[in-house]
Structure formats: C-alpha cells, structure tokens
Interface confidence: low
C-alpha cells in the first residue's frame, strides 16, 4: 500500500523550532572549526591588545565589500573550497618606479606592475590561489566607457583578458576583475615584474580611443596629505589561497573515502 | 537528552532503493506534464504518421547539442523558468538580400540581418522570452582569432555586445552567443529588420584586423548541392519561450500563495 | 564530488547519485513524447551520516564536515546539485513541438 | 522565491529561510574571532508538502510541483539555495589573520 | 521497420581500395549516429568507427590511417573508404546503426545490417 | 585504450541450465556495457545496454549486471534458441568501443 511507502521516506512532522535552532548553531560551531582545520578554538594567550591593525581592518573591509564585476551568487563549491581561504592584498609597484617609463606615453592604456616576490610571499604555491581579484578604484566618470584589460606577455606583447562596460557615475567605485588564471601562472614562472594594461575598446572604425575612466593611483600633482591616502587606495590584488599548512592536510585526504 | 532529539530530525534509516526508484519515476510523470501545463497526456490522434519532420529534428538537435559559448551549468531558476520553454529557430536573412548591399565591402567584419515579423511570429510579446542564442557554425580556422559582436542601433552606429577568443581547430564548430535582451529589445520595437555585426577584435596599436575566422553562410562560389546544406547552416537565432496560452495561466499565479 | 563519474563505479553507502534511465514508453507508459525515447534522469540517495551529539569525539565530527553537513544544517539531506534540461519532441494536434524543460538530468548531489 | 525577502516578512509554515542571528560570544561561548561579532546564519526549515499516492487528484498534485517538488525527488528536502560567505578575523599567536569561509549565510531555501 | 543493407564488397588485390556503400531505410537516418564493424573469418568483432549526425567521425587507433568513414544524409546512405588494403583486413564488414542515449554520447549497436565480405588476396 | 577480456572463452551447457558469463574491464566503465548475441551466418543482436537493461523484446530469461570493471551476463534456463556466441561490448564515452573476443555456447 502507497500510503506506508510515503511514511518510511518522510520525516516526522512535528518539529520542534528551537531545537532546530540549537542544532544549527552547534552544527555552525563545528563548521567553522572545520573550514579552519582546527581541532579546538585557538589560544587567545598572545593576542596583542587594543584594537586591529588598520591594514588587518582595511583587508577585511575589502574581502567583505561587494565589488562592480563579482559574481554576486558563487558557482557549486569544489571540494577543496569547503576549507578557508586566507585572504592577502599586494598593491600595485608605485608609478614613479623605472618599469613604468616606457609605458607612460599613451592615451588609450594604463598600466599596473606587481612584484611577483610580493605574490608569492603571500601564496607560496600556485596550486594554493583559489582566487585573484583585481581591484580599482575608478573615479567619477562623465561619459559610458568600454574598457579592456590585457596581460603583459613577452616583452612588448599584451594577451587580452576581459572587458568592462562603465556607465557614468558621480561617486567613486570599485571595480573587480577575476585575474586567478594569470596570477597562477606568475606563480608558476620566474619573472620578477608582471603587469596589466587597461585600456579604452578601439573598434575597427572608430577614431577617438582615449581613455577617460579616471583610476585611483594614477592622476598627479595631487596634495601631500591626499597622496597618500590615494597611494593606499592604488590598484592592488585581493587574494584568497588556502595556507600552506593546511594544504598538506587536504593532500593527504584527497582520496575521499 | 540528545538522542532523541536527534531522532526527531532524522529520515527513517531503512530506504528501499525500489521504492525510491518508483516514486522517482511517478515524481518525474508528473514533473514533466506540470512543467508543459498539462492535467493529462495530450491526444496523439490527430499525430501524422511517418518520421518527424527533418526541420523539427534539426531543430531538437540544436536545443540538445552543447556548444561552444554556452554556460554549461544552468543558474538556479527564478520561478517562472521552472515551466518548459517552446524552442524555435529563425534562420538569417539570406545573403542575397539587399539589405546586405551597403555593408559588403568590409575585411574586418560580416553583418547579420533578422526578419522581426518571424520573430515576433514564433515569440509575440517580449516579455515571454526567457534565452536567445545567436548560432553560428564556424569552420576551420588556423589561428586564434578574438572576435566580437556589435548589434545594429541606428542607421550607422553599433553598440558592442560581446567577445569571443576562437582557438584554431580542423573541425567546425557551432558558437552561441547570448542575446536575449537584444532580442526582447527587437521585439519591443517597430522595425523590421535588425541585425548583428560580428568583427575582428581591433586593439588600438595593431595593424591587421581582419576576420579570419569563416562562418557558414558567407562563403560564395560553391556548389549547387553543397550550398544548400551551407544555406541551412547559416547563422540562426535559438528562441526559447513561454508560449502564449502558458503565459496566461502563469499570470494568474503570479502571487504564490 | 559526488557526481556520475565517482559515484557510478563505486559502491558508496552515503550521499550520492544514482542510476536511472527513464524509457518514457516502459516506465510512464507514454508514447506521446517523439524524442527522445528516454532519458538518464537519476536521482540522489543516501544518508548525510553526521549527527552532533555531546559524546562524540569533537576531531572525528570536524573531519566528517565536508562530506556530510557542509551547510551546517541542523538535519542534512542528500539533494541534486549539479542539474541539466531535457528537449523533448512532442505534437499539440498536427503540430509538433520543440521544448526544453529545465533541471530534469541529476549530474551531481551533495549533503545540504 | 523563498528568500529572505518573502519568509521573513510571512507567517509561511512550508518550506522557507528563517531568521538566526549567531553571536558568537552568546551563542557559542568564543571570544577568538575579532570581526564580526557575529552573523546573520539563518536556516531552512519547513515541510515540502507534495506526496504522490494513487487517491490524490492529478491536476491538483500538478500545481504544486513547481514549489513544493521542483526536482521531482521521491522525498523532497528543504534546504539552501543561495548562500553568501562570511570573512572572519582572528589570530594565530600574534599574527592576525583575514579568511574567507564559504557558504555560510543562507539568503534562500527551495524544496530539492 | 530498420533495414540496413551493405554492398561494394568481394575480391580485392593487396594495395588496392575499396568503397563500401550502407543503405538504410525505416529510421531517421540523417539523425542517427553510425558505425562500422567487421569480422575476420572465424574470430571475433572489431570496432571501426562511427560518425556522428554531425558528420564528425571517431576511429579506432588502427583504422586512422587507411579507413575513413562519410555519410550522404540526402541519400540514406553510410560508406567506408578503405585503402592500401592488406590480407588481414579480410573479413565481413558490417554497419550498424548507433544508439544515442540522450544526455551522454554512449553507443550501443542497435541494429545491424546482414555484412559484405572483402577478401584481400593476389 | 580499455581491453574487455571474457571468459570462459567457450562453454557446453544443456537445455535448462544456468548459464554464466563473465566480462572484465581493464578500467572501470562504470555500467556503459553493452551485450550481444550472434549466430552462425547472421549479424549481431543487442541483448542488453547500461549493464543490466535488457533491450525490448528479449526475452526475460536474459539478464546482466555489474558495474566498474566487473560484468555478468545469465541465462537463467538455457532455451535450445540460446546455443550461439555472446559478446560483451563498452561503449563508455563514444569515442572508443570495445569489443570482448567472444563466448561460445555449445550443446553439451
């Protein structure tokens, strides 16, 4: 007879609320325990006092901000992404260092250097970089503009990565693109400096290729006081990879079950 | 005491794998007519004999085909997307149309015009279109080629839609690009003809920007026999929408509960 | 991940998809779909074996996470993740049809 | 959708995103992670109420697929989704450090 | 109901070619997937290839070289080119109609045709 | 490239028995199996696809199963119809089939 059939498959029907509650926090205690490979809290016995670092608060504000250009729903977690992600930022190489000299002259490109000594200091392995993110802090903007950004190649070559349609705005805002695939690969080889290009879209036909979105780190001639906190707010990238120690756990569980 | 509670929450552990697999298959009859808005299984008297129609089956094999430039994971489903889409297709006007004449002469591009009337004819109203796919079948290409598609605004200007980077290959290839606002925009409109640019991507520095890549529908010169098979290949529009009559209902339901 | 490719060629007890093909004509009795005759639906079974109780050994259940309650769930069920439409082929009167109907291929499951 | 939106601001009894706030001090009794204080967890609670049986009326049971079994499961599951990360700050010894974790806020549940 | 009939078969001298013709009837043909199959005298079956609706083809490792499979959707009709013939490419040639189970490209032989014999001998 | 090895390679058996025949995979094809019978002068005939499918209009005494590397194909009661030679075949993602060499049923 259906009707037992229905019975051994469905659960009971009387739930009780708050005891749904406390097994979800409970369930959440050990969540985020195990997302951070630990077996216990941490010991809490050589925190520094007061308050956070200011670059510590700056990085988790930037990790917790949703940017122009991420995916606001994340795609069906693989397995290795159930664990935490630690996250680091390395800026861009200042613009009056030497490597920028020869790519000043255009009107139609910026560019952006990073130590890769920087990189991997921050992701020893590139099989470690779950993500990359770079990020600009584009100022206001008169006119919609579609800009690309390519990656350096060989000495004077540029590989095309994405595009961005910008539409006018009048306040400040930051902008993301998912740079993962090209930092891994910085990671993997042994250059020193490795940059992007952003650039105004030239089509075949059109005459007017100049850049006019304003990015944060590149305008001069600015005050000494707001120099700086515009050189804090220069282009840099957000990583996310999972920490060494943790990583040699993972390998050792890779075979599932 | 936990236990128990535990036994509150929790299915019934002993699952027989028929019964699962009997409800499965009753869970699917219905799933299956309540996403084509049937209360029943509709009459099969009036059904002609003999195969389906080849242009039917073409039609089956292009909505079941994967092709290059299509998401491969659908996104979670907003609601009305849970009901069956009716699939139609809207081949390209034909090259020999003068509506072609004034863009012929170009190397860096090749223009694609559409028939509104057939396509408000397959989808009446803009609002039950839930995908258009532009689809074309590339042939061998032997280098990477980056192209992009524009969409035709007013008399002579184009607004960029897109891009694609094309991997050389020894096979052809179908690309899909996605233009589902274009489209809902086209039938919102009063025109009556509209159409697409697809063009080598023109980097502000670089010289040669010609289209490389061959796209069927577009080569002269060739065979009787072998342009007709050409002909039915041309670039189509994939349409997938609501049909009118299952719009109706879904109005009328709008407010769930 | 618990999809076609491990969990066909393994016999695992917990969470995970499972082999059905729908042959519309022998299983729905139907013969008013055209194409195709049937399809690999599948379906997800098995339990999401985690259960927090005060007695268990705290490393065991935190290793046991990301298998069976990543989400954290108060009571983990073993549901579809990975999902992809069917075309059918089916005539209204004279006139045949082309739809898609989405979700209706389980690729994958997980505990959620 | 059954998100936050909808549930929240509803008496729904079936399947739905309901509301749980974690203070981490309060609730779980740690002072180890320094931002946030706490977060807006929620969970997915509430019965997906369609059961197939020879006596129910066919056209009825049609109507309800498309909220209460979605995915034609033969025991559908309420459950997330749509879910948001959670970064988090605390110390390893004397070093701060800033981690992401995954899938950790519920925005949205369906029946699956 | 499906019929599939194959011909060009016979006698055939070492280093020559060959075409082998398969007509079908009673099914879709222009939507079906193909294959060809052959069988040395008294041994077992071996796989050649198939084609796809598409007209894309696939071939076992051995037949790359010197067996191409194509289609005439028009005409219903499969062939097998086979060239630079050798004595142990002796056998009865079959075609058989592939069966798409939907949402994979897994194969089965779904109906056979009755073969042609090819004897490659001086 | 995937090698299907069937054993035994030849069997007698009498009307009424249970018959057994066994297909190993040298990698796992998970159940995208396929078997087949032929008698003397005639083409092949699909039995079963998906490892245990048994195809429209065979008869029920015919079973398979298996899954992985491992296959079985049963003659619950041979029938005198049922003398012939059984070939199991894979067909996991299509772009390779493979055929086993073949297992003789004689009249003992």
């Known amino acids: 007879d259906y009707k037992d059939d229905d019975d051994k498959l469905s659960t009971s029907k009387t739930i009780d609320m708050e005891l749904v509650k406390r097994k979800r926090i409970e369930a959440i205690r050990g969540q985020i325990l195990s997302k951070l490979r630990l077996a216990s809290p941490p010991s809490q016995g050589e925190v520094p006092p007061g308050p956070l670092p200011e670059a510590v608060l700056a990085l988790y504000n930037s990790t917790r901000d949703r940017v122009a250009g991420e995916s606001a729903e994340p795609e069906p977690e693989p397995e290795a992404d159930y664990y935490a992600k630690e996250v680091t930022r390395v800026l861009m190489v200042e613009t009056h260092n030497e490597i920028y000299d020869k790519f000043k002259q255009s009107t139609h490109s910026i560019y952006m250097f990073f130590n890769t000594s920087e990189l991997r200091e921050a992701v020893p392995e590139p099989v470690l970089l779950s993500r990359a993110e770079l990020r600009l802090l584009r100022l206001k903007l008169k006119v919609e503009q579609h800009v690309e950004l390519y990656q350096k190649y060989s000495n004077n070559s540029w590989r095309y990565l994405s595009n961005r349609l910008l539409a006018p705005s009048d306040s400040p805002e930051w902008l993301s693109f998912d740079v993962t695939g090209v930092v891994r690969q910085w990671l993997s080889r042994g250059g020193e400096i490795e940059g992007f290009r952003l650039s105004a879209h030239c089509s075949c036909d059109s005459k007017d290729n100049t850049l006019q979105v304003d990015i944060n780190g590149f305008t001069t001639g600015r005050r000494g006081d707001l120099a700086t906190i515009h050189g804090m707010n220069r282009p840099f990238l957000l990583l996310m990879a999972t920490p060494l120690e943790r990583a040699q756990h993972l390998q050792s569980s890779r075979h599932r079950r | 005491d936990y236990k128990d509670d535990d036994d509150k929450l929790s299915t019934s552990k002993t699952i027989d794998m028929e019964l699962v697999k009997r409800k499965r298959i009753e869970a699917i009859r219905g799933q299956i007519l309540s996403k084509l808005r049937l209360a029943s299984p509709p009459s099969q008297g009036e059904v002609p004999p003999g195969p389906l129609p080849e242009a039917v089956l073409a039609l089956y094999n292009s909505t079941r085909d994967r092709v290059a430039g299509e998401s491969a994971e659908p996104e979670p489903e907003p609601e009305a997307d849970y009901y069956a889409k009716e699939v139609t297709r809207v081949l390209m006007v034909e090259t020999h149309n003068e509506i072609y004449d004034k863009f012929k002469q170009s190397t860096h591009s090749i223009y694609m015009f559409f028939n509104t009337s057939e396509l408000r004819e397959a989808v009446p109203e803009p609002v039950l279109l839930s995908r258009a796919e532009l689809r074309l079948l590339r042939l061998k290409l032997k280098v990477e080629q980056h192209v992009e598609l524009y969409q035709k605004y007013s008399n002579n200007s184009w607004r960029y839609l897109s891009n694609r980077l094309l991997a050389p290959s020894d096979s052809p290839e179908w690309l899909s690009f996605d233009v589902t606002g274009v489209v809902r925009q086209w039938l919102s409109r009063g025109g009556e003809i509209e159409g697409f640019r697809l063009s080598a991507h023109c980097s502000c520095d670089s010289k040669d920007n010609t289209l490389q890549v061959d796209i069927n529908g577009f080569t002269t010169g060739r065979r009787g026999d072998l342009a007709t098979i050409h002909g039915m290949n041309r670039p189509f529009l994939l349409l997938m929408a609501t049909p009118l009559e299952r719009a109706q209902h879904l109005q009328s339901s709008r407010h769930r509960r | 991940a618990l999809d076609t490719n491990y969990c066909f060629s393994s016999t695992e007890k917990n969470c995970c998809v499972r082999q059905l093909y729908i042959d519309f004509r022998k299983d729905l009795g139907w013969k008013w779909i055209h194409e195709p005759k049937g399809y690999h639906a599948n379906f997800c079974l098995g339990p999401c074996p985690y259960i927090w109780s005060l007695d268990t050994q705290y490393s065991k259940v935190l290793a046991l996470y990301n298998q069976h309650n990543p989400g954290a769930s108060a009571a983990p069920c073993c549901v579809p993740q990975a999902l992809e439409p069917l075309p059918i082929v089916y005539y209204v009167g004279r006139k045949p049809k082309v739809e898609q109907l989405s979700n209706m291929i389980v690729r994958s499951c997980k505990c959620s | 959708a059954l998100d936050t939106n909808y549930c929240f601001s509803s008496t729904e009894k079936n399947c739905c995103v309901r509301q749980l706030y974690i203070d981490f001090r309060k609730d779980l009794g740690w002072k180890w992670i320094h931002e946030p204080k706490g977060y807006h967890a929620n969970f997915c609670l509430g019965p997906c109420p369609y059961i197939w049986s020879l006596d129910t009326q066919y056209s009825k049971v049609l109507a309800l697929y498309n909220q209460h079994n979605p995915g034609a499961s033969a025991a559908p599951c309420c459950v997330p989704q749509a879910l948001e990360p959670l970064p988090i700050v605390y110390y390893v010894g004397r070093k701060p450090k800033v981690e992401q974790l995954s899938n950790m806020i519920v925005r949205s549940c369906k029946c699956s | 109901q499906v019929q599939l009939v194959e011909s060009g078969g016979g006698v055939v001298q070492p280093g020559r070619s060959l075409r082998l013709s398969c007509a079908a009837s009673?099914?879709?043909?222009?939507?079906?997937?193909m294959n060809w199959i052959r069988q040395p005298p008294g041994k077992g079956l071996e796989w050649i290839g198939y084609i796809y609706v598409s007209g894309t083809t696939y071939r076992a490792d051995w037949a790359r070289g010197r067996f191409t499979i194509s289609r005439d959707n028009s005409k219903n009709t499969l062939y097998l080119q086979m060239n630079s013939l050798r004595a142990e490419d002796t056998a009865v040639y079959y075609c058989?109609?592939?069966?798409?189970?939907?949402?994979?490209?897994?194969?089965?032989?779904?109906?056979w045709g009755q073969g042609t014999l090819v004897t490659v001998s001086s | 490239d995937i090698q299907m090895t069937q054993s035994p390679s030849s069997l007698s058996a009498s009307v009424g028995d249970r018959v057994t025949i066994t297909c190993q995979a040298s990698?796992?094809?998970?159940?995208?199996l396929a078997w087949y019978q032929q008698k003397p002068g005639q083409p092949p005939k699909l039995l079963i696809y998906?490892?245990?499918t048994l195809e429209s209009g065979v008869p029920s005494r015919f079973s398979g199963s298996g899954s992985g590397t491992d296959f079985t194909l049963t003659i619950s009661s041979l029938q005198p119809e049922d003398f012939a030679t059984y070939y199991c075949?894979?067909?996991?993602?299509?772009?390779?089939?493979?055929f086993g060499q073949g297992t003789k049923v004689e009249i003992k």
């Open positions: 058989a109609r592939g069966w798409h189970i939907f949402g994979h490209h897994y194969w089965v032989m779904h109906a």
């Open positions: 998906a490892a245990s």
């Open positions: 009673g099914f879709h043909f222009s939507s079906e997937a």
């Open positions: 990698e796992s094809i998970s159940t995208y």
């Open positions: 075949q894979s067909y996991s993602d299509g772009d390779s089939v493979i």
